[in-house]
Each structure stands twice: as structure tokens, then as C-alpha cells.
């Protein structure tokens, strides 16, 4: 059979849970610096569903610190100003993954956990239930 | 600054590097149990700034696949079902982390990447530039 | 190309026990999940769990936990699947397909497993 | 469990004709469906993903729609090689079929 090769370089685990548990380098490729959405762009509040950023920190999670986003109306601005209740303001929501201490407090152990979170929100037409 | 409490039973690490290598349980922990993102919605469709879905694969990344929002429109859909062009349609953005195999075939070691992804879209008001 | 080669037909006796393997070849498993669906003759198809091999992480149809077993051996590419307590109507042919947890893009080809006294 | 059901079971069709089946989830799936193609003493093949995009190798004349409940897969101008079995299936939740539809030669 195929067998991958054992690559050299390849820390080696003695972990009795392998391979469930793992070495992950933390020194993260790619990071960029804008974390914080409201630097990014100003789209949360030019928006027709405009929202607000909640800062959600968890000390035992990483990344610590995850924007949420909550709409401000129910329904959407109009070209007046004034919210149209015939539209619906509805958050975006995406999976992320994050690392969570475990054991709590441990500085060097996590597991890997899948969150939602919303990401901003957008006007959407409602779903009309027509009574039979 | 603030320091975390020493947990007796946590892994001890050797690591030179620490804390950027640290071990990670990757038995995923969900914790979107009553809400799955995927069912949530078919906002893509309703948005006055509608998007469509394209899928970014890559087989050395967990996860492999991840689904891209490009606007179908550069301006929103107005009450009337058209194209409003005083309006614009924008990708909502955030950054995500996944993970990747390093070295590559490594069945124990894995480094953390930040990507920026386009989640849905949103309607916003154009900034208007005067010429002076 | 991905392929995946599952091994070959099994003949049970009700209560026991089958273990059906899944192998891919032209590639590692990669970060993809494994997933396994069975069709019962002329039925159609039914999920019965999968596992994310780089991680170990399974998840199970409700119908099959408790019953089913599936694990992968990442150093020889190979994915199994272990159905326990066997009866007449788990008689079915059992896929192995590579599973992106949106759809199923490759399967292997097929192993019939039937459950007779 | 989200169920899946297909309509119609069975249909008879001769080469060169357009060909719509529907599927219809219990609960809303958002566009997390996909087609697949059977046939006799083969695994299934992926046709169509994400509702509407058509995977890499098929032929064009496949197409899907729909979104929320109801989905359609059309085959525009259907093929000798056609004539198979063709299931639908949800990935909004574990996933799940449909019972399948058989597309026999007329």
C-alpha cells in the first residue's frame, strides 16, 4: 500500500491521543493587520441594513478578541433616511474555527472548536406566509 | 500585564518557540449544535444586493472547501425588481482562520493561516467625491 | 486523480461483525472527510457517518451510533468502516466517498456485504 | 432529519428530449443540494453542487436550480448515456437523499 512519506523535518509525537492532538505553530502565516472591521471599511454604517459592532473577548479562546455584528433595525433604511419595515435588515453569519484553552487556563494546550458568528448584516425582501 | 494561573495539569512544553507551538486537541468541538449555518438562509437570493456562491477548494487546507461571495450587482435591487445604480452592492469581509499541514504530509504538525473571505453582500450608499 | 479502492465482498452471519476498508490512492487523504453510504438492493442511498482522517473527528447518523465504528489509518491512506450487531437488512452495497462536508465528489466502487444465516 | 423527495419516480423519455426532475426538501436547505447520477452496478457521480453549479467533467447539458425547498435538475437534450438513476441530496444537515428517479428509455 501506499504509505506517506515520513517527512524528516516532522516533529514526532509520543502523544498517546494521536493523531487527535497535535503541534499547531501559532505564528500565524498571512497576518493581516487589520483585525478590527470598523478600520477595514465603513460599510456597517453606509449600509441600508447598517449594524454595530459588539466586541466579544474570551481570554481562553484565540483569536481573543471577534467582532460581532448586530443590526440595528428590524427592517432597512430607505432613500428618505427612515427605516422601511416592508425590508428586513438580517445578520450574515459564517463558521469560523478558533482554538480554545483546554484544559482552562492552560497557556500551550486548546481545541480546535467551530463557532458562528455574524459578520455584518444585508436587506433582504421577508418571506410572505399567505394564510390558507 | 495579566499572567494565567498555572494549570498542574497541563501538558508541559519543552518547545523553544513556545507559545507559538503549542498542542491542539483536533477533535472539533461544535458549538453551533441548534443553529447549523448552512440551513440558515437563503439571503443570497432575497439581499437587494444578491450574491452568488463560488467555491475557493483546496485540498492541503482544512477546511478544504470555503464558499466566496461575489455581488451579482454592482448597484442593489430597488422595489421595482431592477438595477438601481445610486446604490452599491459590496462583499461583506472577514479574515478566518484555517489550518495547513507543515511540513506538508506531516500527520502531527500544522500551522495556523489567516484568509480573508467575502461572506455575503451588502447594499450601502456611494461616497460621493466632489471635484472641487 | 483521487480514486478510492474499498476491499472486497463479505459474507456475515447475523450478530457479527464486518469491517469494510477504503483506500485512496493518486493522493493522501488530504483535509477532506470520508464518508460512508450504504443501498440496500434496489433501495436508495443512506448516510451513515463520516471522519475527518487528518483529525480523527467522526460524526455519525443517528439511525447507526452506537453500531457503527469508523476510523482512518493516515500512514496507509485507508479508511474503514466497522458495522456491529449485523442482521438481514443491513444486506447492502457499503460506499466510501470523499466528502468536502458539502457534497460527495468521489466514491469508491463498492463492496456488498450480505448478512445471511 | 431533513427528508428529501423526488418527483417523479419513474419517467420515460427518448433521446433528444428535455428532461426536469424536481426535488423538495421538509425544511428549508438554502442552496446546500446536490445531483447525482446512477447507474446499474456503478457508484453515484456527482453532477451538480451547490444547487446550481456543475461540477467539473459533466456535460453541459445538466443544469440545476432552485433554492430553499424546491430544486429542479434538467438534462436539456438527454443522451443515450443518460438513461441511469438520479438522486438528489441535502448537505444543509447530515446529509440525506432523495428515493431516486429512473430515467428509462421511451
Known amino acids: 500500500g501506499i504509505t506517506i512519506p515520513r517527512n524528516p523535518g516532522c516533529p514526532n509525537s509520543e502523544d498517546k491521543n494521536f493523531p487527535r492532538t497535535v503541534m499547531v505553530n501559532l505564528n500565524i502565516h498571512n497576518r493581516n493587520t487589520n483585525t478590527n472591521p470598523k478600520r477595514s471599511s465603513d460599510y456597517y454604517n453606509r449600509s441600508t441594513s447598517p449594524w454595530n459592532l459588539h466586541r466579544n473577548e474570551d481570554p481562553e479562546r484565540y483569536p481573543s478578541v471577534i467582532w460581532e455584528a448586530q443590526c440595528r433595525h428590524l427592517g432597512c433604511i430607505n432613500a428618505d433616511g427612515n427605516v422601511d419595515y416592508h425590508m428586513n435588515s438580517v445578520p450574515i453569519q459564517q463558521e469560523i474555527l478558533v482554538l480554545r484553552r483546554e484544559p482552562p487556563h492552560c497557556p500551550n494546550s486548546f481545541r480546535l472548536e467551530k463557532i458562528l458568528v455574524s459578520v455584518g448584516c444585508t436587506c433582504v425582501t421577508p418571506i410572505v406566509h399567505h394564510v390558507q | 500585564g495579566i499572567t494565567i494561573p498555572r494549570n498542574p495539569g497541563c501538558p508541559n512544553s519543552e518547545d523553544k518557540n513556545f507559545p507559538r507551538t503549542v498542542m491542539v486537541n483536533l477533535n472539533i468541538h461544535n458549538r453551533n449544535t441548534n443553529t447549523n449555518p448552512k440551513r440558515s438562509s437563503d439571503y443570497y437570493n432575497r439581499s437587494t444586493s444578491p450574491w452568488n456562491l463560488h467555491r475557493n477548494e483546496d485540498p492541503e487546507r482544512y477546511p478544504s472547501v470555503i464558499w466566496e461571495a461575489q455581488c451579482r450587482h454592482l448597484g442593489c435591487i430597488n422595489a421595482d425588481g431592477n438595477v438601481d445604480y445610486h446604490m452599491n452592492s459590496v462583499p461583506i469581509q472577514q479574515e478566518i482562520l484555517v489550518l495547513r499541514r507543515e511540513p506538508p504530509h506531516c500527520p502531527n504538525s500544522f500551522r495556523l493561516e489567516k484568509i480573508l473571505v467575502s461572506v455575503g453582500c451588502t447594499c450601502v450608499t456611494p461616497i460621493v467625491h466632489h471635484v472641487q | 486523480q483521487v480514486q478510492l479502492v474499498q476491499s472486497g465482498a463479505e459474507v456475515k452471519k447475523p450478530g457479527s461483525s464486518v469491517k469494510v476498508s477504503c483506500k485512496a490512492s493518486?493522493?493522501?487523504?488530504?483535509?477532506?472527510?470520508i464518508s460512508w453510504v450504504r443501498q440496500a438492493p434496489g433501495q436508495g442511498l443512506e448516510w451513515m457517518g463520516s471522519?475527518?482522517?487528518?483529525?480523527?473527528?467522526?460524526n455519525y447518523a443517528q439511525k447507526f451510533q452506537g453500531r457503527v465504528t469508523i476510523t482512518a489509518d493516515e500512514s496507509t491512506s485507508t479508511a474503514y468502516m466497522e458495522l456491529s450487531s449485523l442482521r438481514s437488512e443491513d444486506t447492502a452495497v457499503y460506499y466510501c466517498?470523499?466528502?468536502?462536508?458539502?457534497?460527495?465528489?468521489?466514491w469508491g466502487q463498492g463492496t456488498l456485504v450480505t448478512v445471511s444465516s | 432529519d431533513i427528508q428529501m423527495t423526488q418527483s417523479p419516480s419513474s419517467l420515460s423519455a427518448s433521446v433528444g428530449d428535455r428532461v426536469t426532475i424536481t426535488c423538495r426538501a421538509s425544511?428549508?436547505?438554502?442552496?446546500?443540494l446536490n445531483w447525482y447520477q446512477q447507474k446499474p452496478g456503478k457508484a453515484p457521480k456527482l453532477l451538480i453542487y451547490?444547487?446550481?453549479s456543475l461540477q467539473s467533467g459533466v456535460p453541459s447539458r445538466f443544469s440545476g436550480s432552485g433554492s430553499g425547498t424546491d430544486f429542479t435538475l434538467t438534462i436539456s437534450s438527454l443522451q443515450p448515456e443518460d438513461f441511469a438513476v438520479y438522486y438528489c441530496?441535502?448537505?444543509?444537515?447530515?446529509?440525506?437523499f432523495g428515493q431516486g428517479t429512473k430515467v428509462e428509455i421511451k
Open positions: 466517498a470523499r466528502d468536502s462536508e458539502y457534497y460527495f465528489d468521489h
Open positions: 493518486g493522493g493522501t487523504f488530504s483535509s477532506y472527510a
Open positions: 471522519i475527518i482522517p487528518w483529525f480523527g473527528t467522526t
Open positions: 425544511q428549508g436547505i438554502s442552496n446546500w
Open positions: 451547490a444547487a446550481s
Open positions: 441530496q441535502q448537505y444543509s444537515d447530515d446529509p440525506t
